[in-house]
């Protein structure tokens, strides 16, 4: 005869363990009984459990209550046990001895192996701002037994760095992912994959990068120079720009105050029915936490009663 | 995937025997157990005995010793359960299903059922 | 042999409702228990093994619990594919044993 088992038995943490022990033997041979015990050890080997076929299962004091036989019904063939509740440290190699009858006493070494699924967290960056150099954007770490593989799923061209630190029982893994900070990264995901045999599936965590920016300012409202004429209603400026954060508006007049009845609606001036008084330098400053930029335009309000153009300068400055 | 194929109905008379089949398929046959088991007309469910497909040792529930014999075909990946001295008691709904006890898994619940076989005892 | 009783044999619910079924052992099964669903069809499937752990491919609403000899199934949330007859069964100790079925109908 001969016993059958497996080289290797692979269980999560916290799953129960069955490790395999079976005797092929030939017709009319018996199992008298089958010891149990971890093989690895430092200080010899330590028993585990001791099924006898006329006296049933003793499982040593250092495993009361994690070890059991099969549940019924039984093959007297089968000296398999169920080690409950599997932890890190039951992690080694174990044997089986088995006494039968007539054939004598067999023995077979298994590996139990427990694998520790990773909790992977992820840990954004510094700020980005458009204009940096190479930044990082995010870390990743993940430990677990044995090491997880850490990797990036992104639209987003950018550089990996990772690596690994080893303790007693497990392994810690850090991935790095940096990049060169621009607008159109904004809003973009950032999925840290963690993958690892102790996994159904795949672990994500999705960063969404925010990359700061300050686009230049521009007004517009002044096309059509010959709208610009007294009397004329509903005249407008509005003022152009986008920025992460989003930037707010503030409209000041560069050679005085703004006139009376002019309303300032966010990044829009609207004007009331307009007279010569409104002609001026007029200034956008547009800001956020990352920059500022200023527009200024200059308004030249038509009088018919005048024979003279309407001349319309515009001025850009940072 | 896992299959149990079972006849749907014998008819046989009483005193004679009948041997009703269990086909698997879409797994390692001789790697699970194969239960079997009886349900009456509008009854519940009774567990006859099972074989260890791996080396035919078999398992049976005391009142359906002498009834019950349950035997393998490995070539075929078949199960077999023969009823003897059949009486109107024995008319039934029978049952195969498979067993997790394997190298590697717990035998815990029956996973995999056959959708049964009628037997009828009547003359 | 261990005597498996489902005291209710039948039970009428209404879809979306929370439906317990109980089941007792005559002796303490160290929570070798299990729940099969057998559809009107005659099909026969394993819902719940060892108590409480669910079968691959059972639908969550489904969940065991129970120790020693005390042991129930609930359905969170009926749905008219639950319509069908739950059996527990025993597997502590030979020969295995199952309930007399609980007939589970929509009102």
């Known amino acids: 005869g001969e016993l059958e088992t497996s080289d290797v038995v692979t269980v999560v943490l916290g799953q129960d363990a069955k490790l395999p022990c079976f005797y092929r033997g030939d017709s009319g041979e018996q199992v008298g009984q089958v010891a149990w015990a971890r093989a690895d050890a430092g200080e010899g080997a330590q028993e585990l459990a001791l099924l006898h076929s006329k006296y049933g299962l003793h499982v040593s004091p250092a495993y009361e209550g994690r070890v059991e036989q099969p549940p019924p019904p039984r093959n007297p063939l089968d000296g398999s046990v169920l080690l409950r509740n599997a932890v890190q440290a039951d992690e080694g190699e174990y044997e089986c001895r088995v006494s039968t009858f007539p054939a004598g006493s067999f023995q077979a070494r298994l590996r139990l192996r427990v694998l520790v699924p990773p909790l992977p967290s992820l840990n954004p960056g510094p700020a980005l701002e458009e204009g940096q150099g190479l930044t990082l954007a995010a870390s990743c770490t993940a430990e677990g037994s044995p090491a997880p593989s850490v990797t990036w799923d992104t639209e987003v061209k950018g550089t990996t760095s990772s690596r690994s630190f080893k303790h007693s029982r497990s392994a810690a893994v850090t991935s790095e992912f940096h990049l060169v900070p621009s607008r159109s990264m904004n809003g973009q995901p950032l999925t840290c994959v963690v993958s690892h045999p102790g996994l159904l599936q795949d672990q994500r965590i999705t960063h969404i990068l925010h990359v700061s920016f300050l686009a230049e300012a521009s007004v517009r409202g002044l096309e059509d120079q010959n709208l610009w004429h007294v009397g004329r209603e509903g005249a407008m400026l509005k003022c152009l720009s986008e920025g992460q954060p989003p930037p707010s508006y503030n409209w000041t007049r560069l050679d005085g105050p703004l006139p009376s009845g002019v309303r300032v609606d966010g990044d829009t001036l609207g004007f009331p029915p307009l007279t010569t008084e409104h002609s001026g330098i007029y200034v956008c400053h547009v800001s956020n936490e990352f920059s500022s930029r200023d527009s200024q335009v200059t308004v030249d309000v038509l009088d018919p009663q005048e024979d003279s153009g309407k001349q319309v300068d515009l001025v850009s400055a940072s | 995937q896992v299959q149990l194929q079972q006849p749907g109905a014998e008819l046989v008379m009483p005193g004679a025997s009948v041997k009703m089949s269990c086909k698997a398929s879409?797994?390692?046959?001789?790697?699970?157990?194969m239960h079997w088991v009886k349900q009456r007309p509008g009854q519940g469910l009774e567990w006859i005995g099972a074989i260890d497909t791996s080396d035919s040792y078999t398992s049976y529930n005391q009142k359906f010793k002498g009834k019950a014999t349950l035997t393998v075909d490995e070539s075929s990946s078949t199960a077999y359960m023969q009823l003897s001295s059949l009486t109107s008691e024995d008319s039934a709904v029978y049952y195969c299903a498979r067993w997790g006890s394997t190298m590697i898994t717990w035998g815990y619940g029956m996973d995999n059922w056959g959708q049964g076989t009628s037997v009828t005892v009547s003359s | 042999d261990i005597q498996m009783t489902q005291t209710t044999s039948s039970l009428s619910a209404s879809l979306g409702d929370r439906v317990t079924i109980s089941c007792r052992a005559s002796q303490d099964i160290n929570n070798y228990l299990n729940w099969y669903q057998q559809k009107p069809d005659g099909t026969v499937k394993l819902l719940i093994y060892?108590?409480?752990r669910l079968h691959s491919g059972v639908p969550s609403r489904f969940s065991g619990s129970g120790s020693g000899t005390d042991y129930s199934l609930t359905i969170s949330n009926l749905e008219q594919e639950d319509i069908a007859t739950y059996f527990c069964?025993?597997?502590?100790?030979?020969?295995?044993?199952f309930g007399g079925g609980t007939k589970l109908e929509i009102k």
């Open positions: 060892y108590t409480s």
């Open positions: 879409g797994y390692t046959f001789t790697d699970y157990w």
């Open positions: 069964q025993q597997g502590n100790t030979l020969p295995w044993t």
